[in-house]
């Protein structure tokens, strides 16, 4: 798997999309996990609804939300209020039994807010030991939430 790079601005929301073949992964729940080191395990952050037919409902763990278009074949992860510590390597996974297939390897990069004048570097990336081989950059269009806007509306 090549690594796809998604860049977001600190304090804003970043949307990561992971396309997959809807028929090949029929009936499978999905997960978003964080890679702990280059050879380390992938630590589950959030997974889709326990009932697969309800995978379109947004599930959330802290500032990370996940939703799955099981028919169209797109898993979407939203990282809200992006922070420097969110930078790193992640995976979108398709779960079956105790196994997990990697749908996409993702590198999240956090850019400094251009309106923030703190004396800081403009890019947070993982440690130099982590591989950037075959990385494909995909800029994510994101925006700040409007005042009073509910980022993740409650699902009925």
């Amino acid at each position: 798997h090549n690594t796809t790079v998604f860049q977001g601005v600190e304090g804003q929301s970043l949307q990561v999309s992971c396309p997959y073949d809807s028929m090949k992964h029929w009936g499978r729940r999905k997960a978003w996990c964080r890679q702990l080191g280059e050879k380390g395990p992938c630590q589950r952050v959030v997974s889709t609804h326990n009932l697969w037919l309800l995978s379109f409902l947004r599930r959330r763990n802290g500032s990370t939300a996940i939703t799955d278009d099981t028919l169209g074949g797109t898993l979407t992860i939203t990282l809200r209020n992006l922070q420097p510590h969110d930078a790193g390597f992640y995976q979108c996974q398709s779960l079956h039994g105790s196994e997990a297939d990697t749908l996409r390897k993702v590198l999240v990069e956090v850019l400094a807010d251009p309106l923030d004048h703190r004396d800081a570097g403009d890019l947070w990336v993982p440690g130099e030991s982590e591989s950037f081989e075959d990385a494909h950059v995909e800029h994510s269009i994101s925006r700040s939430l409007l005042e009073g806007e509910i980022p993740f509306p409650p699902t009925s």
Epitope: D21, S22, M23, K24, W26, G27, L53, L54, F56
Partner: antibody
């Protein structure tokens, strides 16, 4: 027992639309996706699309994109398939078919609805 | 789209015969293959899913095998009610597609 009962045969003129219904019983309607498959006279099977009965989300085969609309009414456990701008090549038996979550195969089928398009 | 080619397109057999129908996919579909039986004027009936799993209620004389691009449906001892048309269906890649069918006739 699981049953999918479809509406009766239809005769339509070219350019018209047809709406076929599929009433489910014997299982929880919102627990399974519903698909539509058609079969022209003496021909093979052709997948048209699928609907999630909970969300109403749909995916259609490219061939039918823009002409087919799949909907559902969960209150009466019924799925619908509407095909517009009919042409003679659309003459076929239309089947609704249930899809379990463990495999993308069609485990129960409706009895079929013959749609004849003729001027 | 993936093309599914069944062979033969028709065959004649007698009750008690062992019958084999093959299905070839135009590209690798792993084991994402199903088999159906259809009788005239009736809806198809699911026999086998995931290449070799027998659908509930289907007689054990039906079996499926294969992986990748080549698959087989076997009827170990043909019964009078087995005379029908058989279709394979792949669902390893969207959109799902069917073979053209194999008609099993009485010899």
């Amino acid at each position: 027992q699981v049953q999918l009962v479809q509406s009766g045969a239809e005769v339509k003129k070219p350019g018209a639309s047809v709406k076929v219904s599929c009433k489910a019983s014997g299982y929880t309607f919102t627990g399974y996706h519903m698909s539509w498959v058609r079969q022209a006279p003496g021909q093979g099977l052709e997948w048209m699309g699928v609907i999630n009965p909970v969300s109403g989300n749909t995916v259609y085969a490219q061939k039918f994109q823009g002409r087919v609309t799949m909907t559902r009414d969960t209150s009466i456990s019924t799925a619908y398939m509407e095909l517009s701008r009919l042409r003679s090549e659309d003459t076929a038996v239309y089947y609704c078919a249930r899809i379990p979550s463990y495999t993308y195969a069609f485990d129960y089928w409706g009895q079929g609805t013959l749609v004849t398009v003729s001027s | 789209d993936i093309q599914m080619t069944q062979s033969p397109s028709s065959l004649s057999a007698s009750v008690g015969d062992r019958v084999t129908i093959t299905c070839r996919a135009s590209q690798d579909i792993s084991n994402y293959l199903a088999w159906y039986q259809q009788k005239p004027g009736k809806a198809p009936k699911l026999l086998i899913y995931r290449a070799s799993s027998l659908q509930s209620g289907v007689p054990s004389r039906f079996s499926g095998s294969g992986s990748g691009t080549d698959f087989t449906l076997t009827i170990s001892s043909l019964q009078p009610e087995d005379f029908a048309t058989y279709y394979c269906q792949q669902h390893g890649h969207s959109p799902t597609t069917f073979g053209q069918g194999t008609k099993v006739e009485i010899k």
